[in-house]
Interface confidence: low
Amino acid sequence: MVRLPLQCVLWGCLLTAVHPEPPTACREKQYLINSQCCSLCQPGQKLVSDCTEFTETECLPCGESEFLDTWNRETHCHQHKYCDPNLGLRVQQKGTSETDTICTCEEGWHCTSEACESCVLHRSCSPGFGVKQIATGVSDTICEPCPVGFFSNVSSAFEKCHPWTSCETKDLVVQQAGTNKTDVVCGPQDRLRALVVIPIIFGILFAILLVLVFIKKVAKKPTNKAPHPKQEPQEINFPDDLPGSNTAAPVQETLHGCQPVTQEDGKESRISVQERQ
């Protein structure tokens, strides 16, 4: 199609012939050349020759690894981006005659810039720090310090800070406090109870034993009324071994004031003041 000046449309060709004036602007998808408006080449094609009064703009498709992504008057197509594996890049989206190749980084790496010209390994978060945001193809790992109540004991590019174990929910007690790098250590509550309960039990048994020995002594007094003045014993001896200890120790019986007294071997024979009298 022959390209004519724009004034032909506006004022008619006759007027233009009398007062020729070059166009100052062209329509969309056109360009001005040699006082004429020529069609731009469509995306995926490059310019071979401009239009004339008698010929259309001549365009040619881009080659195998080339592209042009806009309406253009370029005489050369652009080369597709090369995703250099030596820079850690790989093809995310293959280029066409109208689009460039899109590169991305290999697994474990991210782009160093928006243009993704090279890659860098994802950073990991050290123990005491957790991952706030996992790295993407374009951004590095974002770490944050583990707050009180949380911990991280590994270097990782994925692990967040973990909450301390709740001993209470497991019916356990905290045996060792947690830190930002270590979890709390839980233990059975029995240990704590035992520390309190065992001495109490022993105390009770001890008191019962005292009472029993006292009652036994009182019960063993002669029933016939002896002409002894009534006196309380001044000393009471009870066995050193608590209940449950070895009771098979050899014993000997002696008579004190007509009352048999059982005496263990190896124990000092002591008689109450009342019995000696």
Partner: antibody
């Protein structure tokens, strides 16, 4: 204690080929990087190549090493380095090394090295 | 490839002195830098990672600083045991682990 050990170092003639092997003890290569570094007698350290032992299995070379040297993982505990077209300039102690994610990929594990001598 | 340039190539200081080693990256590597100590016949030992974080068991006399392209390792109160070669390394930035040329530290 985790360790790395290189083997395969030898005295060879120029133009010969050689395969070096790095064997891990008490750990396996699971989604980690394994590298080879060399050091010519009385010279500095020179990075050769690294391989990623994860699913993507990428390999990365110093520009001077591309084409002549090939790094590959041969099992869960071994990585090899194939050397071809050897010249006297390749005479060096070859170290197997493991960069660590916890150290921003600095190398915290090294083997003792294996000596490759290229001489006619 | 990223190129790491380390200066000086050697440094000599008396016991109790201070040594400063510089490392420059050919492009910004953020804080992806490690420092190693190597003694003859041994593999390198990690001293500092993430430009300034001390590896476990490393003396606080070792101090790393910097980010982007300029990094520094400072060793204060030098001891005889600090005599070694020190290397900087870019760690996993743009899939590259290049080392600096190394600095030999002599303690007088």
């Amino acid at each position: 204690c985790q360790s790395l050990e290189e083997s395969g170092g030898d005295l060879v003639k120029p133009g010969a080929s050689l395969t070096l092997t790095c064997t891990a003890s008490r750990f396996s290569f699971s989604s980690t990087y394994m590298c080879w570094v060399r050091q010519a007698p009385g010279k500095g350290l020179e990075w050769i190549a690294c391989t990623y032992t994860g699913s993507s299995g990428g390999t990365y070379y110093a520009s001077w090493a591309k084409g002549r040297f090939t790094i590959s993982q041969t099992s869960s505990t071994t990585v090899t380095l194939q050397l071809t077209g050897l010249t006297p300039a390749d005479t060096a102690t070859y170290f197997c090394a493991r960069p660590d994610v916890g150290f921003d990929f600095a190398i915290n594990f090294w083997g003792p090295g294996t000596l490759v001598t290229v001489s006619s | 490839d990223i190129v790491m340039t380390q200066t000086p190539s050697s440094a000599s200081e008396p016991v109790g002195g201070t040594v400063t080693i510089k490392c420059q990256a050919s492009q910004s590597i953020s804080s992806r830098l490690a420092w190693y100590q190597q003694k003859p016949g041994q593999p390198p030992k990690l001293l500092i990672y993430r430009a300034s974080t001390l590896a476990s068991g490393v003396s606080s006399r070792f101090k790393g600083s910097g980010s982007g392209t300029q990094f520094t390792l400072t060793i204060s109160d030098l001891e005889c045991a600090d005599a070694a070669t020190y290397y900087c390394q870019c760690t996993g930035y743009t899939i590259s682990w290049p080392f600096g040329g190394g600095t030999e530290v002599v303690v007088k």
